[in-house]
């Protein structure tokens, strides 16, 4: 079998064997090595010498196989834009940011650039659970049967109605989507407006 070409090697068709780790240098018509993540090009390749790579300095990074002559500067997560850090910048990866609790991503350009406060869900509703926290604004859905939610809140969940009998009590007023069941002592008389017809 033919020996594998090691960079730099000539390429007449403008393509390189290893698309991830090599790049085409059109002026010399050669394929050269890219630099691995966490490094940059400190000396460009020539017909007789391959790319020379160097490690990114502190507070800078390159995430992919590249032929950049500089490392990219680490950027902090901007709290003014509602972002918080979940993982620090390393030589191989930029700072990982997410929206602060109670916020969602309102502007996206490859990554979140701006977060805004989640909308409140009114009484009788709750925010639909999302696959990923902070990805979108709240979508409020009604509480399911037998549940209630009595505040305007971005995060309050619908709770099951109290079962009076579990507490040795009886129901005085049924629960709604916005209020819990009202219970009373079974020996207590009903309030006048709730009493049935009285037999004389």
């Amino acid at each position: 079998s033919q020996p594998q070409a090691v960079p730099p090697y000539a390429s007449e068709n403008q393509t390189c064997r290893d698309q991830e780790k090599e790049y085409y240098e059109p002026q010399h018509r050669i394929c050269c090595s890219r630099c691995p993540p966490g490094t940059y090009v400190s000396a460009k390749c020539s017909r007789i010498r391959d790319t020379v790579c160097a490690t990114c300095a502190e507070n800078s990074y390159n995430e992919h196989w590249n032929y950049l002559t500089i490392c990219q500067l680490c950027r902090p997560c901007d709290p003014v834009m509602g972002l918080e850090e979940i993982a620090p910048c390393t030589s191989k990866r930029k700072t990982q940011c997410r929206c602060q609790p109670g916020m969602f991503c309102a502007a996206w350009a490859l990554e979140c650039t701006h977060c805004e406060l989640l909308s409140d869900c009114p009484p009788g509703t709750e925010a639909e659970l999302k696959d990923e926290v902070g990805k979108g604004n709240n979508h409020c859905v009604p509480c399911k049967a037998g549940h209630f939610q009595n505040t305007s809140s971005p995060s309050a969940r619908c709770q099951p109605h109290t079962r009076c009998e579990n507490q040795g009590l009886v129901e005085a007023a049924p629960g709604t989507a916005q209020s819990d069941t009202t219970c009373k002592n079974p020996l207590e008389p009903l309030p006048p407006e709730m009493s049935g017809t009285m037999l004389m």
Epitope: T15, Q19, E20, Y23, Y24, H64, N66, Y67, L68, T69
Partner: nanobody
């Protein structure tokens, strides 16, 4: 995936001018070097002009002083202004971009220039 679409080719008289455009679309982000190549009838594809991510340009000797490569990063487009065209400039012109900060190389479908 990135798509490149060239336009601006056509039939022109010797001494005339044309401006080729190459627009990138799809998942186009990152840092790119941009190139124009051409393939004359029955010949190999050859490099015409380079626009690097650092703002440098370079040209094949045969087009120096006549062709100008430029780019509009906001529009994800690279241009080739061709003046004082000659019969030997007749070719299919291809746009090529190579991502610098990550793997990726893409070609346009080509646009025919006939002088």
């Amino acid at each position: 995936e990135v798509q490149l679409v060239e336009s601006g080719g056509g039939l022109v008289q010797p001494g005339g001018s044309l401006r080729l455009s190459c627009a990138a679309s799809g998942r186009f982000f990152g840092i790119y070097d941009m190139y124009w190549y051409r393939q004359p009838p029955g010949k190999q594809r050859e490099l015409v002009a380079i626009s690097t991510s650092g703002g440098h340009t370079n040209y094949a000797d045969s087009v120096k002083g006549r062709f100008t490569i430029s780019r509009d990063n906001a529009k994800n487009t690279v241009y080739l202004q061709m003046n004082s065209l000659r019969p030997e400039d007749t070719a299919v012109y291809y746009c090529n971009i190579q991502r610098v900060d990550a793997p990726g190389m893409y070609w346009g479908q080509g646009t025919l220039v006939t002088v």
